[in-house]
C-alpha cells in the first residue's frame, strides 16, 4: 500500500470522482439530481462538503508527489529547513475547542485560505498525471473563500495578500531547483491539508453547521460552482 | 512502528497521575494520537485527540480533568487529575490517520495500561 | 451530541454463516465512521474507515457499508477467530461529546 509521510493509508477511494473517472462538473452529477428526496443543503452543509472535496483533491496530489519523489518520506530536518511562510492555526486563532471564538476564527480560516492562494497557484505547473486535480483544488478553494465572506460578519478584519508580493513570492518558488521544488510542493499540500482540517473542526462548532444530508453514496464530493452561491 | 503506554499504577482516589505514550517509528508531528479507556468488562470510552496543529479535543466527561500533551518528538502524556474508583481502566494510546477534520482512524494501538483507583 | 448506538449485543452466528451488525448515530455523520474488532486481553484493531474502506490486511469477509445514520458491518463466511466486540466509531464531530465509540457488539460463534 502506499503510504505517505503522514500515516494516511491512501487505498480509499478518491470520492470526488465520478464512476467514468472524470472529475464532477458543477451541477452535472446525475446521481445528485436523481435524488429527490434529499433536502436542499445549507450553507453550512455546502461548506463542509467543499471542503471535504478539496481534502479528496489534495489526498490524490499527495499521492502523485509521494510516488514522484522520496520528499514524504524526508526527514523532520529536512522539513524544518523550509522558510515557506505558509498559514497555520495557533491557539491565538480561536478555532481550536479551548478558547474557540467563532468571529476570530471565521477570519482566520479565511485570511488563510486567501494566503493559501498563491501557493495553489505555485502548484498548478507541478503535476502530470493529476493536473485536473490541481486546478480543482485550487478553484474550489476560490469558491469555498467566497462562501465563507458570505458567512463572515467582520469582513474589515480579513486581510487580502498584497498582489506584487504575491506574484514575486511566485516568480521565487518557480526558481528553485528541482528537489527545493519538491519539497516546497510537498510542504505545501502537507500544510494545506492541515489547514483544512484544523477549519472543518472549528467549522463543525459553528451554530448551524451540524449535519450533513444523508447520501446514499457516502460522502461524495461534488464540486460546488459559483451559480451554487 | 509501534506504540507503548506505561505509568499505570495502583493510585488512591485524589491523587492525580501522568501516563506516557511512547512511539516508535512514527514522527509524532506528522500524527494525530488518542487516548482512548476502558474500564474492566466495559466498552471503549474516548478520552481525547492530539492533532498534528497540536489542537486537542476531549469527550465532554475528560474536559478540565485530563490533559493530553506531546512532551517530546517521541512521546504524548496523558495527565489525570482528581481520579476517582470510576476511573480504574486500561488505558489505551492510539496512532491516527485523518482524512477530514475529526474522522480520526485509530490503525495503531499500544496494548494499554492497567490503572487502579482504589482506597 | 452525537451519540452511537450498537445493536444487537450480544449476536451469535454459525460457522460458514453470516452476521450482521447494525450501528446508529442520532444524526448525520456521512461516511465518517470506522469500525473495530477487539479479542479478550488485545488491544482494538481498526477493519474498516470511511464506512466501507477495508483496511490493508483484514479479510475481505469484512464489509462495511451505510452512511447518514445508519451504519452495517456484516462478516461472511463467519471463523471461529471471528469471536470478538466490535465497536463502530463517529469521526464527524468530536465537540460536544461523550463518547465517539458505540457500546460494541459481542459475536459468539457456534
Known amino acids: 500500500d502506499y503510504k505517505d509521510h503522514d500515516g494516511d493509508y491512501k487505498d480509499h477511494d478518491i470520492d470526488y470522482k465520478d464512476d467514468d473517472d472524470k472529475l464532477v462538473p458543477p451541477g452535472e452529477d446525475s446521481k445528485d439530481v436523481a435524488a429527490p428526496h434529499r433536502q436542499p443543503l445549507t450553507s453550512s452543509e455546502r461548506i463542509d462538503k467543499q471542503i471535504r472535496y478539496i481534502l479528496d483533491g489534495i489526498s490524490a496530489l499527495r499521492k502523485e508527489t509521494c510516488n514522484k519523489s522520496n520528499m514524504c518520506e524526508s526527514s523532520k530536518e529536512a522539513l524544518a529547513e523550509n522558510n515557506l511562510n505558509l498559514p497555520k492555526m495557533a491557539e491565538k486563532d480561536g478555532c481550536f475547542q479551548s478558547g474557540f471564538n467563532e468571529e476570530t476564527c471565521l477570519v482566520k480560516i479565511i485570511t488563510g485560505l486567501l494566503e493559501f492562494e498563491v501557493y495553489l497557484e505555485y502548484l498548478q505547473n507541478r503535476f502530470e498525471s493529476s493536473e485536473e486535480q490541481a486546478r480543482a483544488v485550487q478553484m474550489s478553494t476560490k469558491v469555498l473563500i467566497q462562501f465563507l465572506q458570505k458567512k463572515a460578519k467582520n469582513l474589515d478584519a480579513i486581510t487580502t495578500p498584497d498582489p506584487t508580493t504575491n506574484a514575486s513570492l511566485l516568480t521565487k518558488l518557480q526558481a528553485q531547483n528541482q528537489w527545493l521544488q519538491d519539497m516546497t510542493t510537498h510542504l505545501i499540500l502537507r500544510s494545506f491539508k492541515e489547514f483544512l482540517q484544523s477549519s472543518l473542526r472549528a467549522l463543525r462548532q459553528m451554530g448551524d453547521l451540524i449535519s450533513v444530508p444523508v447520501d446514499s453514496r457516502g460522502s461524495e464530493q461534488k464540486l460546488i460552482s459559483e451559480e451554487d452561491l | 512502528q509501534s506504540v507503548e503506554e506505561s505509568g499505570g499504577r495502583l493510585v488512591t482516589p485524589g491523587t492525580p497521575l501522568t501516563l506516557t505514550c511512547t512511539v516508535s517509528g512514527i514522527d509524532l508531528s506528522s500524527y494525530d494520537m488518542s487516548w482512548v479507556r476502558q474500564a474492566p468488562g466495559k466498552g471503549l470510552e474516548w478520552i481525547g485527540y492530539i492533532y498534528t496543529d497540536s489542537s486537542t479535543w476531549y469527550a465532554n466527561w475528560a474536559k478540565g480533568r485530563f490533559t493530553i500533551s506531546k512532551t517530546s518528538s517521541t512521546t504524548v502524556d496523558l495527565k489525570m487529575t482528581s481520579l476517582t474508583t470510576e476511573d480504574t481502566a486500561t488505558y489505551f494510546c492510539?496512532?491516527?490517520?485523518?482524512?477530514?477534520?475529526?474522522?480520526?482512524?485509530?490503525?495503531?494501538w499500544g496494548p494499554g495500561t492497567l490503572v487502579t483507583v482504589s482506597s | 451530541n452525537i451519540v452511537m448506538t450498537q445493536t444487537p449485543s450480544p449476536v451469535s452466528g454459525a460457522v460458514g454463516g453470516t452476521v450482521t451488525i447494525n450501528c446508529q448515530a442520532s444524526?448525520?455523520?456521512?461516511?465518517?465512521l470506522s469500525w473495530y474488532q477487539q479479542k479478550p486481553g488485545q488491544p482494538p484493531r481498526l477493519l474498516i474507515y470511511?464506512?466501507?474502506t477495508l483496511t490493508s490486511g483484514v479479510s475481505s469477509r469484512f464489509k462495511g457499508s451505510g452512511a447518514g445514520t445508519q451504519f452495517t458491518l456484516t462478516i461472511s463466511g463467519v471463523e471461529c477467530a471471528d469471536a470478538a466486540t466490535y465497536y463502530c466509531?463517529?469521526?464527524?464531530?468530536?465537540?460536544?461529546?461523550?463518547?465517539?465509540f458505540g457500546g460494541g457488539t459481542k459475536v459468539v460463534v457456534v
Open positions: 444524526q448525520s455523520i456521512s461516511n465518517e
Open positions: 470511511r464506512a466501507s
Open positions: 492510539a496512532k491516527g490517520s485523518t482524512d477530514y477534520a475529526f474522522d480520526t482512524r485509530l490503525d495503531l
Open positions: 466509531q463517529q469521526g464527524y464531530n468530536s465537540n460536544d461529546v461523550d463518547n465517539v
